[in-house]
């Protein structure tokens, strides 16, 4: 049925889906607080621009009776139920902020006539790539994949003189939502990562991973996994590791590595951590005081979703353009807007760009140090530490295949 949008005559509404099944186990109250803080900022910015309009949010909760796993497994149906609720109420905002699970976003995108924009804090999977009216404000799997291929091919840095073309991927099925889709993208046989690598094997059992660490017949020295240091320790413990093993630990939404008093545990010495350049202004924010670093990124994405809407609303109002048009729905991409913590850039497909940071553990200081940064917007690597104090021989990353000479 045709749903009218509450989106004209100086009154603009944001529909926020408050789903029980979510990419991160975040109390909905915290997300509400993030949205409300964002609304205050948007109202201030619009008033500052001389635009006397009203902007509000409607929070739409599912009943939680059927879809109560809490993670993303039953999110498909929950998302569609919420859409049905909107349809029955005959009331929709100018924009839909909400689904963070890849399953729910994919299905909702398919099942709606999208003449309005959809903003997601999550939806990491490849199946949510290249959607014309979907904007994703947390780094999707495609961005990770492009970094890894770029890094694998790099062979002209003082600390990386070999191109790599092989990898193991550890994926045991217990991952968080972000990790699940990141690893899923690496595993997919049709993905860019798989296409660019000559050898790739997925390790699904703890024992498989543990055996590879000292297996003389291993096909690659590089293992990609996703999670935090504690996750790695549970798996690896204090087991001996061959000297030319490199573990790439993907831990994007965790800025604990940058805290002043953090010392890297010994088991991290042959690990490179891939994370995002840290933010710091949320620490004083009312809605984020009790959040873990990961959850801070999730709440920040909700807040930035509101600011993005405010940014687009301001542009369209100043240009005298209608908000309830396909042009507005398709406009949330290929732009930079002022987020809560500085400028946020969206690529041509509405996906957030960011600076990824590759860290290593200094054998001298036992601190995490920045090895290089990677700008997802330009797909370019920038070395930071040209003389890293690695654990690896000659302070250089080893070849990915033992015994193979330089290429």
């Amino acid at each position: 049925s045709q749903v009218s949008q509450n989106c004209h005559n100086g009154s603009y509404e944001i529909s926020v889906l408050m789903m029980g099944n979510s990419a991160f186990a975040e109390p909905l109250k915290n997300l509400e607080d993030a949205v409300n803080e964002g609304l205050e900022i948007v109202r201030g910015r619009l008033q500052n621009a001389g635009l006397n309009v009203t902007v509000n949010a409607t929070f739409m909760y599912s009943d939680g009776l059927i879809h109560n796993s809490g993670d993303c497994r039953s999110s498909t149906c929950e998302g569609l139920d919420l859409l049905r609720k909107i349809s029955n109420a005959q009331r929709m905002g100018c924009v839909l902020i909400g689904p963070s699970c890849t399953y729910s976003t994919f299905q909702m995108y398919l099942d709606t006539e999208l003449s309005y924009p959809m903003i997601s804090a999550g939806s990491f999977g490849l199946s949510c790539d290249y959607k014309e009216t979907l904007t994703r404000l947390m780094s999707p799997a495609r961005k990770l994949m492009y970094f890894l291929v770029n890094f694998w091919k790099t062979n002209d840095l003082p600390f990386k003189t070999y191109s790599w073309s092989t990898s193991y991927v550890y994926k045991n099925g217990t991952e968080t939502e972000d990790c699940f889709w990141y690893l899923n993208a690496l595993e997919a046989s049709v993905s860019y990562f798989s296409h660019e690598l000559g050898f790739k094997v997925v390790l699904r059992q703890d024992k498989e991973f543990q055996d590879i660490l000292m297996d003389h017949n291993r096909k690659s020295n590089v293992i990609i996994m996703c999670g935090g240091p504690e996750f790695l320790y549970k798996l690896k413990g204090d087991r001996a590791v061959a000297e030319d093993i490199v573990i790439i630990l993907v831990d994007l939404f965790n800025d604990q590595y940058f805290e002043d008093n953090v010392t890297a545990p010994d088991y991290m010495k042959n690990v490179l951590v891939l994370t995002l350049s840290p933010g710091n202004s949320l620490l004083n924010s009312s809605f984020s005081r009790n959040l873990s670093p990961t959850k801070r990124d999730f709440a920040l994405a909700y807040l930035n979703g509101i600011l993005l809407f405010g940014h687009m609303l301001k542009i369209f109002l100043e240009n005298g353009e209608n908000i309830t048009t396909p042009k507005f729905a398709h406009a949330f991409r290929n732009l930079t807007f002022e987020g809560y913590d500085g400028p946020v850039t969206l690529d041509d497909w509405g996906d957030v760009d960011s600076t990824m940071v590759l860290l290593y553990t200094s054998v001298d200081t036992k601190k995490y140090k920045v090895l290089l940064t990677y700008d997802t917007h330009v797909n370019k690597t920038y070395p930071v530490d040209m003389s890293p104090t690695f654990t690896w021989k000659n302070s250089k990353l080893p070849n990915d295949i033992t015994g193979r000479g330089p290429q």
């Epitope: 900022i41 201030g44 910015r45 008033q47 500052n48 621009a49 001389g50 635009l51 933010g279 710091n280 202004s281 004083n284 100043e318 002022e338 913590d341 500085g342 400028p343």
Partner: antibody, heavy 119, light 107 residues
Amino acid sequence: QVQLQQWGAGLLKPSETLSLTCAVFGGSFSGYYWSWIRQPPGKGLEWIGEINHRGNINDNPSLKSRVTISVDTSKNQFALKLSSVTAADTAVYYCARERGYTYGNYEHWGQGTLVTVSS
Amino acid sequence: EIVMTQSPATLSVSPGERATLSCRASQTVNRNLAWYQQKPGQAPRLLIYGASTRATGIPARFSGSGSGTEFTLTIGSLQSEDFAVYYCQQYKTWPRTFGQGTNVEIK
């Protein structure tokens, strides 16, 4: 109550580098862009540039090649350097805080520092 | 960059009279316009933003109007403390730019 206190050398010779620092007291440092604005004697105001707590900078293309703006969040301070100064850079230099994040209009100002360039 | 032009350069008004100051932008700034007052030896003081909204603590005799490229600052009944230089400023885009100022002096 937000206060901006600025300091730096007041007398420079041509070709030297102007260096000013602005300290922020009271209020949040992270929720704003912090600006430098100058005013030659008896003339109007010229916007030099701005920086936020993350080090994101917007600056005036007319001065860009000579301007360096930096931030030290641990001290709630930001700074301006202007290289290769000439007599045309003689002005009162103000630091300022916008009314709200990215608002672009200025509610709080430093006391101003007169910088004279003379041989 | 957007050039802001103010007129007149000097305005002579008697206390109690109304003063009308104009500001023109070289291209549209919508309503992203502010007005400031500056007295000798002091930093500028924000009066108006959003073309017509008074900043905190600014008396009601100050009012702003306009949109796009033409803007006006009106001072309803000039008090002795209102004699100063007034600047308009656009914040639609970077670089932020100011007008050259209008000096409001006692007639």
